[in-house]
């Protein structure tokens, strides 16, 4: 009686179970009663990443430099090429089809997490006692200067965008 289901890594064709081609190979011809499934390795710049019965391999992804992309990991016959973004850019999506510049944290905000090739800068507001007076994709909020440790007094309080201004102890108001 012909089978209705096949084992893992097999497929049903013409009422018989044939072996699937292993990753990195494509199907040339189905098995018969007398012959095994015929498979061929994928060509240069092609891949198949699963046990399959595909007659064509997939093309490796092209990391287009015009879109700010570069190769992070070269593809093999079993894996696709992985693209990432050039320095200062990050992917616009999980599949990384194009790149955009990293966001800068505005004055009053500091970098909580520096951007990577796949994630944008995360900014956070500077709390009281800290400031940032620059627009930057790298700088964290900096602590206000401690006038006391310099034997000085605060002449002007700091803000989230400015440091404290220190002055001499004997300053007359």
């Amino acid at each position: 009686e012909p089978p209705t289901a096949c084992r893992e890594k097999q497929y049903l064709i013409n009422s018989q179970c044939c072996s699937l081609c292993q990753p990195g190979q494509k199907l040339v011809s189905d098995c018969t009663e007398f012959t095994e499934t015929e498979c061929l390795p994928c060509g240069e710049s092609e891949f198949l990443d699963t046990w399959n019965r595909e007659t064509r391999c997939h093309q490796h992804k092209y990391c287009d430099p015009n879109l700010g992309l570069r190769v992070q990991q070269k593809g093999t016959s079993e894996t696709d090429t992985i693209c990432t973004c050039e320095e200062g850019l990050h992917c616009t999506s999980e599949s990384c089809e194009s790149c955009v510049p990293h966001r800068s944290c505005l004055p009053g905000f500091g970098v909580k997490q520096i951007a990577t090739g796949v994630s944008d800068t995360i900014c956070e507001p500077c709390p009281v006692g800290f400031f940032s007076n620059v627009s930057s994709a790298f700088e964290k909020c900096r602590p206000w200067t401690s006038c006391e440790t310099k034997d000085l007094v605060v002449q002007q309080a700091g803000t989230n965008k400015t440091d404290v201004v220190c002055g001499p102890q004997d300053r007359q108001r």
């Epitope: 909580k112 709390p127 009281v128 006692g129 401690s146 006391e148 605060v154 309080a157 108001r173």
Partner: antibody, heavy 122, light 113 residues
């Protein structure tokens, strides 16, 4: 020990001004922020503004900007909060409290004055 | 401005009960540089000034009984009274001090059941 002693209760007419004082002792007055907070009858706490007495630097809540003036006299270790153009909704207990002491790590209010009741009524 | 929302607005409890009050901030009060949460809790009794209980979200102010504790991080915070005492019937406020203007929660009144 740290103490903040406020001036006595006031009754004011609408449109007038009130000036509440807060005399500090037991710590370095000039280097610690003085905060002003008010509480209308049966209501919650509302921050109005603050001053760093040694520098005269101030911060004000937007709601009170232009109507409140916070000052300090370091020679007498006294802070003042003046509220102008009074209306009935300004009837409240006004508190002063000590904020950060220059260490930049103590922004919470660890000592409070006893409060000053200001009643605005025609 | 950072909004602070407390719940519940009132709670009826008996002496010995465990009481939990929550406070939610409209933005994170946690700062990555020092990993501190800029939040304080105060207790206020009728006709009295507020009293500091907890600062940095979980540090107990000197002289405050250990039955009071604070927890939470980011936007969600809790004040817990492990075993309510007669003197604990009061109104409790959370307050952030992350950035100006400082704001308070609307308060939670702990009443006798």
């Amino acid at each position: 020990q740290v103490q903040l002693v406020q001036s006595g209760a006031e009754v004011k007419k609408p449109g007038s001004s009130v000036k509440v004082s807060c005399k500090a002792s037991g710590y370095t007055f000039s280097t610690s922020w003085i905060e002003w907070i008010r509480q209308a009858p049966g209501q919650g706490l509302e921050w109005m503004g603050s001053i760093l007495p040694g520098s005269g630097s101030t911060n004000y809540a937007q709601k009170f900007q232009g109507r409140v003036t916070i000052t300090a006299d370091t020679s007498t270790s006294t802070a003042y909060m003046e509220l102008s153009s009074l209306r009935s909704e300004d009837t409240a207990v006004y508190y002063c409290a000590r904020g950060d002491d220059g260490s930049y790590v103590r922004w919470y209010f660890d000592h409070w004055g006893q409060g000053t009741l200001v009643t605005v009524s025609s | 401005d950072i909004q602070m929302t407390q719940s519940p607005s009132s709670v009826s409890a008996s002496v010995g009960d465990r009481v939990t009050i929550t406070c939610r901030a409209s933005q994170s009060l946690n700062f990555s540089v020092n990993q501190k949460n800029y939040l304080a809790w105060y207790q206020q009794k009728p006709g009295k000034a507020p009293k500091l209980l907890i600062y940095w979200a979980s540090s107990l102010q000197s002289g405050v009984p250990s039955r009071f504790s604070g927890s939470g991080s980011g936007t969600d915070f809790t004040l817990t009274i492990s075993s309510l005492q007669p003197e604990d019937f009061a109104t409790y406020y959370c307050q952030h001090y992350y950035s100006y203007p400082w704001t308070f929660g609307q308060g939670t009144k702990v009443e006798i059941k």
